[in-house]
Interface confidence: low
């Protein structure tokens, strides 16, 4: 039975029964977040031979080996990967060996085996026999090999049963467990797989086979599987599917996309049954299963469920890649970014029509709107309050709208509004009125002749804060209601805030002509009640962190000696409250006598306050039965047992200081200080670990169904 389109087993180990009849998992297999240690011995899935995507194991308590669960898992194809990996074993607290003794091939992708405190038999597996390239494998933070005492079958009795290969200049026996060797095929087979009896399989077999030189006896196929036979290519009238098998047209027609109920069905293109047409192609009619090349950019209608799509980063712009018609409103709010104009052009440059309104505000990174290089029509079917369909507010570096000599843009309905664009000439706005056909629609205040194109700005009134309240991740501030001569001229307030370890920031920190801006900005509307003081709750802040905050009043033009009059506050420095620290790092214990343990650790990465003390708890554990499976007498010494710290291997506490040559003198002394390059490499390594862990958590933690 083919199972799919991906199996996620979590929380309850009995869900494993879903794998009972699976021979191939078409998709991924996740086994994760089973926190109660269970006895897995009664669970065995000998039918499972192939996983077409990847295998992910994460925090499964009580599972000591995968060999009993998946004794015949032979191939992980890696058709789709989990963060570049086809096999991920992460934070498996009780796993003692991988034990996948029949795993012969990982077709694509690398492996990541990390933070498995009790995991051994890693140095005894030659991954180069399973993967094409081992350079991207990441095996870190598991039990140190010298504490494992890994012994391959027969070594103790001096009758070794396993074959040897060289890894890192070390020629040694290769095995998965104490009683399972790593299978190697005779050199005469070359790249071909072999049977248990070392007979070479058919060239189209992958991993293994039940009979030699027979393309119907393969455990898995090198290329494609069709009607019981491994074939180099799919036969006529069949189509490649999911990277491993051939299906007919009817099968493809009735596949329903697992991702969305709103998508059209699968298509057949270039001999493959796929979810949608590839780039540069479009369906030949909405019901069609076939793709035709687009003339020019492919028409693509994109719709935002919430009606308004906010573009505040390259990531959000990415969602519009390839869109030619945008059904909804665009709110562009780009405050910073590297190479932002070309990135935005890449993702938004094909948009021709926006059915609603376009609003550009606080986009200090923008110098021009030319990234919307194909925009020709704003329908204005939905408008902002005041009947605006093109609204440009507070863009500090905006100098050009479009090149009007080469641009034909129509605004079908609605007015334009321009304010607080100090580098945008009013003549440029008037030109846009003419080109877009909106001349005569705007009223006098819609195009502000004083604060558009006016670099100089004289803010003379001071806003005073009236209260501040903090919690561990929130700051509430209020300030005096600013009362300009004409109360109607006050539009709103903008609060600027950022982390400030030292009290030395200025309003213009990190802001330059390229649009870099280190301040976060929040708009605050006026309280409806004129007697209520305005305020804001800033949330999502870091505990025990000092922030700088200031507020600006957003006002209409008030002429006073030919200057724009406004108001802003001084910069206020305020610290959030302390919180619970993150866990101490690199916990390490060793015994220096029969009645003592020495425990060491590093401070938490996020102290979230001033640390005053640590609490150490311990309890007696039953003797680990796994110890008795090894004959440690055959080793030179019995290693001191410790649990891996889950990050990197650290030397024993009890060892003597290293003897190294330092500063030209010989003799015992401390290790030489790390070079800048080493420090940088360590920093990048730590960063890489963090990025992967975040990716893992974001991928697998989902809200519990209500």
């Amino acid at each position: 039975e083919i199972c799919g389109p991906g199996i996620d087993i979590r929380n309850d180990y009995q869900q494993l029964k879903r794998l009972e009849n699976c021979t191939v998992i078409e998709g991924y297999l996740h086994i994760l977040l089973i926190s109660k240690a269970e006895d897995y011995r009664s669970y065995r899935f000998p039918k499972l031979t192939v996983i077409t995507e990847y295998l992910l194991l994460f925090r499964v308590a009580g599972l000591e080996s995968l060999g009993d669960l998946f004794p015949n898992l032979t191939v992980i194809r890696g058709w789709k990967l989990f963060y570049n990996y086809a096999l991920v074993i992460f934070e498996m607290t009780n796993l003692k060996d991988i034990g996948l003794y029949n795993l012969r091939n990982i077709t694509r992708g690398a492996i990541r085996i990390e933070k498995n405190a009790d995991l051994c038999y890693l140095s005894t597996v030659d991954w180069s026999l399973i993967l094409d390239a081992v350079s991207n494998n990441y095996i870190v933070g598991n039990k140190p090999p010298k504490e494992c005492g890994d012994l391959c079958p027969g070594t103790m009795e001096e009758k070794p049963m396993c074959e040897k290969t060289t890894i890192n200049n070390e020629y040694n026996y290769r095995c998965w467990t104490t009683n399972r060797c790593q299978k190697m095929c005779p050199s005469t087979c070359g790249k071909r797989a072999c049977t248990e009896n070392n007979e070479c399989c058919h060239p189209e077999c992958l991993g293994s086979c039940s009979a030699p030189d027979n393309d119907t006896a393969c455990v898995a196929c090198r290329h494609y599987y069709y009607a019981g036979v491994c074939v180099p290519a799919c036969p006529p009238n069949t189509y490649r599917f999911e990277g491993w098998r051939c299906v007919d047209r009817d099968f493809c027609a009735n596949i329903l996309s697992a991702e969305s109920s709103d998508s059209e069905g699968f298509v057949i293109h270039d001999g493959e049954c796929m979810q949608e047409c590839p780039s540069g192609f479009i369906r030949n009619g909405s019901q069609s299963m076939y793709c035709i090349p687009c003339e020019g950019p492919c028409p693509k209608v994109c719709e935002e469920e919430k009606k308004t799509k906010t573009i505040d980063s390259v990531t959000s712009a990415q969602m519009l890649q390839g869109c030619t018609i945008f059904k909804g409103n665009l709110l562009i709010n780009i405050r910073r970014g590297n190479n932002i104009a070309s990135e935005l052009e890449n993702f938004m440059g094909l948009i021709e029509v926006v059915t609603g309104y376009v609003k550009i505000r606080h986009s200090h990174a923008l110098v021009s709107l030319s990234f919307l290089k194909n925009l020709r029509l704003i329908l204005g079917e939905e408008q902002l309050e005041g009947n605006y369909s093109f609204y440009v507010l507070d863009n500090q570096n905006l100098q050009q709208l479009w090149d009007w000599d080469h641009r034909n843009l129509t605004i079908k309905a609605g007015k334009m509004y321009f304010a607080f664009n100090p580098k945008l000439c009013v003549s440029e706005i008037y030109r846009m009125e003419e080109v877009t056909g909106t001349k005569g629609r705007q009223s006098k205040g819609d195009i502000n002749t004083r604060n558009n194109g006016e670099r100089a700005s004289c803010e003379s009134d001071v806003l005073h804060f009236t209260s501040t309240t903090t919690s561990k991740n929130r700051i509430i501030i209020t300030w005096h209601r600013y009362r300009p001569p004409d109360y109607r001229d006050l539009i709103s307030f903008t609060v600027y805030y950022k982390e400030a370890p030292f009290k030395n920031v200025t309003e213009y920190d990190g802001q330059d002509a390229c649009g870099s801006n280190s301040w976060n900005m929040v708009d605050v509307d006026l309280p409806p009640n004129k007697d209520v003081e305005p305020g804001i709750l800033l949330h999502g802040l870091k505990p025990w962190t000092q922030y700088a905050v200031y507020v600006k009043a957003v006002t209409l033009t008030m002429v006073e000696n030919d200057h724009i009059r406004g108001a802003k506050s001084e910069i206020l420095y305020i610290r959030t409250n302390a919180s619970v620290p993150s866990i101490p790092l690199d916990v390490l214990s060793a015994s220096n006598s029969s009645s003592q343990l020495i425990v060491k650790w590093n401070p938490p990465s996020l102290p979230n306050g001033n640390l005053s003390y640590y609490i150490v708890r311990w309890q007696r554990q039953p003797q680990d039965g796994y110890l008795y499976r090894h004959n440690y007498c055959s080793k030179d010494k019995i290693p001191i047992r410790k649990y891996a710290d889950g990050t990197i291997d650290i030397e024993e506490v009890t060892e003597n200081p290293k003897t190294e040559v330092c500063g030209g003198e010989k003799g015992p002394c401390c290790a030489c200080p790390k070079t800048e390059a080493e420090k940088q490499a360590e920093k990048e390594e730590a960063e890489y670990r963090k990025v992967f862990e975040n990716f893992l958590h974001n991928s697998i933690f989902v809200p519990r169904p209500e």
Epitope: A253, S261, G265, G285, S286, Q287, S288
Partner: antibody
Framework: QIQLVQSGPDLKKPGETVKISCKAS????????MNWVKQAPGKDLKWMGW????????TYADDFKGRFAFSLETSASTAYLQINNLKNEDTATYFC??????????????WGAGTTVTVSS | DIQMTQTTSSLSASLGDRVTISCRAS??????LNWYQQKPDGSVKLLIY???RLHSGVPSRFSGSGSGTDYSLTISNLEQEDIATYFC?????????FGGGTKLEIK
Amino acid sequence: QIQLVQSGPDLKKPGETVKISCKASGYTFTNHGMNWVKQAPGKDLKWMGWINTNTGEPTYADDFKGRFAFSLETSASTAYLQINNLKNEDTATYFCASPLYYRNGRYFDVWGAGTTVTVSS
Amino acid sequence: DIQMTQTTSSLSASLGDRVTISCRASQDISNYLNWYQQKPDGSVKLLIYYTSRLHSGVPSRFSGSGSGTDYSLTISNLEQEDIATYFCQQGKTLPWTFGGGTKLEIK
């Protein structure tokens, strides 16, 4: 205005044949599949299958293989359901329904008013 | 085939009431659950697709929720025109299957 207009009620004897029509208007007929749904008196709805209006290729649910046939008259934007060798249990109201959003019709956003077929000797 | 069960075949409520109609699938249908309204004259129309998405033109007093195998349709403020039979339908796996229907009446 998007609508599906079905033919009127029909009274037939067992063993006879009935052909129900469903005329589409207000949208491109060949862009969206046509589904057929049966509702026996006092019973729930039962999906019979669909026809690809682009290719004319029908797909039948297991219970409706054999005596039932879907066909098209594309020039008239009309789909047909024909039931041969009528039985008493074919007495029901038959709806045509089109999914204007999804090729295989995970949901049907346009429905005909239904055609009641009565089979009685 | 996936069986769809509407345990309540008929339901009486007063105008202005909040009414909830439930539907259960025999297996996980991954939110591919749609709701239809059949008026006494026999006409059928789509109300909600993909568990909670309101079809265009449907009043906002209708809402849907659920996940896995259990789903429900809620009418927040019952009006006279809502008197009808309501069917659920799964769109996860062919053949599409409908629930037995829940007939809504006025007390």
